[in-house]
Amino acid sequence: KLLQVSTIAMQQQEKLIQQERALLNFTEWKRSCALQMKYCQAFMQNSLSSAHNSSPCPNNWIQNRESCYYVSEIWSIWHTSQENCLKEGSTLLQIESKEEMDFITGSLRKIKGSYDYWVGLSQDGHSGRWLWQDGSSPSPGLLPAERSQSANQVCGYVKSNSLLSSNCSTWKYFICEKYALRSSV
């Protein structure tokens, strides 16, 4: 009889341990959920405030059609410029058409005047071909005027209404580009 009671007691104790474990797991799960909830709420808040502003481009960016452009206020070499754009979820400007080139040069005239701005164009050291950063070739009307006689890597930049080339290690302003947010309305 005593053995039976002690077996029951052990079973009860085991059950209690399991319940305690379950409770601990539940508490942990609840805490995790609360954290996730906080995170989601913060994300929603950001999304809502962005939606409330309903601007397809971030502050200080310029919109044209499906693109947003950022004209830097600092100088950097071409590679650093690219990284600065990536930090903002963008890449160096890739000019797809004469219309886009005209918009960019027109905007620059209004903003800053005649400075040099890196764009996402570089010359392959082996083949000498000009390529945009995504690997595509520029259209014939958008090839840089031959200007750089550099033995180093050569990159493209915009000045006034021209596309020119220069040693990638020189310091210039730069232009970033990202897609404009589509309005879901």
Epitope: L86, G89, G135
Partner: nanobody, 115 residues
């Protein structure tokens, strides 16, 4: 904080292919772009390829047409598909997450291309 875990490196013959993966965890909502780097001259790291959240890509000249960067948002993972590999592609490849305030690096994965 953002944690990055690379995988997919290994030994391959020249002309072969490899696919590197970089899985991100932690504060992933702060990530704006992700990229792959490898060593360059003078103890620097060069950006091999990168992809922004909206899918824009950038590649270093030497890999254009051979490497392709892509992302799977559901898995918070970025991939680097490396085709037509050359012995000069041999290197440690690091994954990097770009946020507005800070950059995060993975531990790196070794790629060796034998001739």
């Amino acid at each position: 904080q953002v944690q990055l875990q690379e995988s997919g490196g290994g030994l391959v013959q020249a002309g072969g292919s490899l696919r590197l993966s970089c899985a991100a965890s932690g504060s992933i909502l702060s990530i704006n772009s992700m990229g792959w780097y490898r060593p360059a001259l003078g103890n620097q790291r060069e950006l091999v390829a990168a992809i922004t959240n909206d899918g824009r890509t950038t590649y270093v000249d030497s890999v254009k047409g051979r490497f392709t960067i892509s992302r799977d948002n559901a898995k918070n993972t970025v991939y680097l598909q490396m085709n037509s590999l050359k012995p000069e592609d041999t290197a440690v490849y690091w994954c990097k997450a770009f946020t507005r305030d800070k950059d995060y690096w993975g531990q790196g994965t070794q790629v060796t291309v034998s001739s």
